[in-house]
Interface confidence: low
Amino acid sequence: GWVWNQFFVPEEMNTTSHHVGRLRSDLDNGNNSFQYKLLGAGAGSTFIIDERTGDIYAIEKLDREERSLYILRAQVIDITTGRAVEPESEFVIKVSDINDNEPKFLDEPYEAIVPEMSPEGTLVIQVTASDADDPSSGNNARLLYSLLQGQPYFSVEPTTGVIRISSKMDRELQDEYWVIIQAKDMIGQPGALSGTTSVLIKLSDVNDNKPIFKESLYRLTVSESAPTGTSIGTIMAYDNDIGENAEMDYSIEEDDSQTFDIITNHETQEGIVILKKKVNFEHQNHYGIRAKVKNHHVDEQLMKYHTEASTTFIKIQVEDVDEPPLFLLPYYIFEIFEETPQGSFVGVVSATDPDNRKSPIRYSITRSKVFNIDDNGTITTTNSLDREISAWYNLSITATEKYNIEQISSIPVYVQVLNINDHAPEFSQYYESYVCENAGSGQVIQTISAVDRDESIEEHHFYFNLSVEDTNSSSFTIIDNQDNTAVILTNRTGFNLQEEPIFYISILIADNGIPSLTSTNTLTIHVCDCDDSGSTQTCQYQELMLSMGFKTE
């Protein structure tokens, strides 16, 4: 098995290497080729092993306060066989302590706040020193606290480091004190190491002063173009207190117009006068308001200092601004029937100059070839309108002051073109039909449908008929399906490709408009040589071959 004792290394050894101890297998008689290996944190860097003897050396100066023990693993291998002689084993190297660390106040800088005029015995702060030395090693880390500076106002408890008030203090005479505390290890015995810390003790304020305006009158100006929420100026009061006792809130005491507000900038303790409602120079060009200021936090027992709030008067002058024309409406919607002649009346827009001088207004339309506007705001057409080309027009009307052409306003004007029944229905697509020579009477040749470019007021309804000539002499007939479609049927039995290869049928389609419009549409029907089954495919193939110039027997 393994043979070893407890390993200790004194810290702060100045020798380049220090013999820690020896790892040995009891199978090692000194003549074996045993190779010892050291594994784990510190192996090969902090600790080196003589791989033949098992001697462990510390090659670095160790600091117990940095690391008090090293857990390492040992192996022993017979290098002639490469096999382990013993199972890998874990061992500990402990670093023994010396009193090489002075007490340190790790939490410094210390700063404490205590209310002024606090009674004797009031706890201020506890300072704690740490000694990195081993607390279980004698008195190396046992501490005593003492006061080096701070009498007669403060005292410190020797074993706890608690600082207390020993005499009342007045912030108005002195607002902060520096106290120096010493901590000694070895409970103060000879050879002790010491550390000191400074404690800044600040006396906190009590709220015995109210904020006061230094100015009894403020003069501010605001432009009539300023939006609501605009800051138009600042006012300021002063408070001899500090901290939150000097925090103040500004408010309006008098403002009949309810046009202004005051908000408080809590960083600068200024009052910011804010525009709550837009002002109009032409309506009112000056205002007078009264503001007051109070502390934000007032303790109940200190209310006697805050009975009457300080106030100030604020005169606000409104500056005139040349404003752009104002339209009566934010937008306009006009209607006009299609096909009305050019120069037809569409509608009237109206804008006025809100300023006192009431400049005349000129109107213009941005990029429109269809409409015109005159100086009275009357919009007329410059062309006849076709709803089927454009049902709506989005116009931009601009109003410009005659005396200041830079003052411009624009609004949208929407013109809806209303429908009139000016389009007859027509085939929805081009139809080309086929009929077999051996077709019987009543055979469906084609289903047709129609479309109408006009807008349907309720719903389009189309009426299908054959022309008078076709009705009288036609080999075909038409049935209106009453759903805007119709079917073409054969009106006889048998057709002859040689005699009549193509029929052109004129179909009348009427709409339900007022007045009703009718169109004539031609349906082409090819006669085909079909097989006995009357297969349409054969018919189509036959027709295709004919169209390509081939004759089929």
């Epitope: 190779q35 090969g44 860097s45 080196i48 791989e51 033949r52 290098i79």
Partner: antibody, heavy 120, light 108 residues
Framework: QVQLQESGPGLVKPSETLSLTCTVS????????WSWIRQPPGKGLEWIGY???????NYNPSLKSRVTMSVDTSKNQFSLKLSSVTAADTAVYYC??????????????WGQGTLVTVSS | EIVLTQSPGTLSLSPGERATLSCRAS???????LAWYQQKPGQAPRLLIF???SRATGIPDRFSGSGSGTDFTLTISRLEPEDFAVYHC?????????FGGGTKVEIK
């Protein structure tokens, strides 16, 4: 095959910190120990120390107080910092790969080396 | 640390001759833990031998290593023109790893 390339300033002022980076290409930095070796002009080689890919280090005691090594596996790079340099630190600095365990510590392959001159 | 002393400092030989380079350790080095390197001017060292006697990949068999304990030898059986260079020994059995001062093999 694995290739190593040193990079860094060729001139450093006395008392300043020498900083070099070795970029490994053609293979992963993981699983190996990576060493820095230097060679003053006309002199022998001196092992500065190694860094394992996981960040553990072992430095030559003669330089330990001034040496810091670091590794960035994501970039396949490892670095050397040597502080408070003097003219005695003027050398060609090489990076090299050790074995894949702590036992096999010959160096192969090596970077081509970079000359660092310490001068004001 | 283990100090490695290489001798001779310079070896002057002609191509085709045999070169014998010595590396002596200040304390015993396991034969498994010694390497030899070749270095040409302006180039990085190149591994020749590791474990005192094992040839690295791609190294011609004219290079051989031997020795144990404190005395190690690198032998170049027949010098080729490209073999003229500086040769370093290195021990890796103890930290810190150390190199010998080098032996320069030059053309006579």
């Amino acid at each position: 095959q694995v290739q190593l390339q040193e990079s860094g300033p060729g001139l450093v002022k006395p008392s300043e910190t020498l900083s070099l980076t070795c970029t490994v290409s053609g293979g992963s930095i993981s699983g190996y120990y990576w060493s820095w070796i230097r060679q003053p002009p006309g002199k022998g080689l001196e092992w500065i120390g190694y860094i394992y890919y996981i960040g553990s280090t072992n430095y030559n005691p003669s330089l330990k107080s001034r040496v810091t090594m670091s590794v960035d596996t994501s970039k396949n790079q490892f670095s050397l910092k040597l502080s408070s340099v003097t003219a005695a630190d003027t050398a060609v600095y090489y990076c090299a790969r050790d074995g894949s365990s702590g036992w096999y510590r010959w160096f192969d392959p090596w970077g081509q080396g970079t000359l660092v001159t310490v001068s004001s | 640390e283990i100090v490695l002393t290489q001798s001779p400092g310079t070896l002057s030989l002609s191509p085709g001759e045999r070169a014998t380079l010595s590396c002596r350790a200040s304390q015993s080095v396991s034969s498994s833990y010694l390497a030899w390197y070749q270095q040409k001017p302006g180039q990085a060292p190149r591994l020749l031998i590791f474990g005192a006697s094992s040839r690295a990949t791609g190294i011609p068999d004219r290079f051989s290593g031997s020795g144990s304990g404190t005395d190690f030898t690198l032998t170049i059986s027949r010098l080729e023109p490209e073999d003229f260079a500086v040769y370093h020994c290195q021990q890796y059995g103890n930290s810190p790893l150390t190199f010998g001062g080098g032996t320069k093999v030059e053309i006579k």
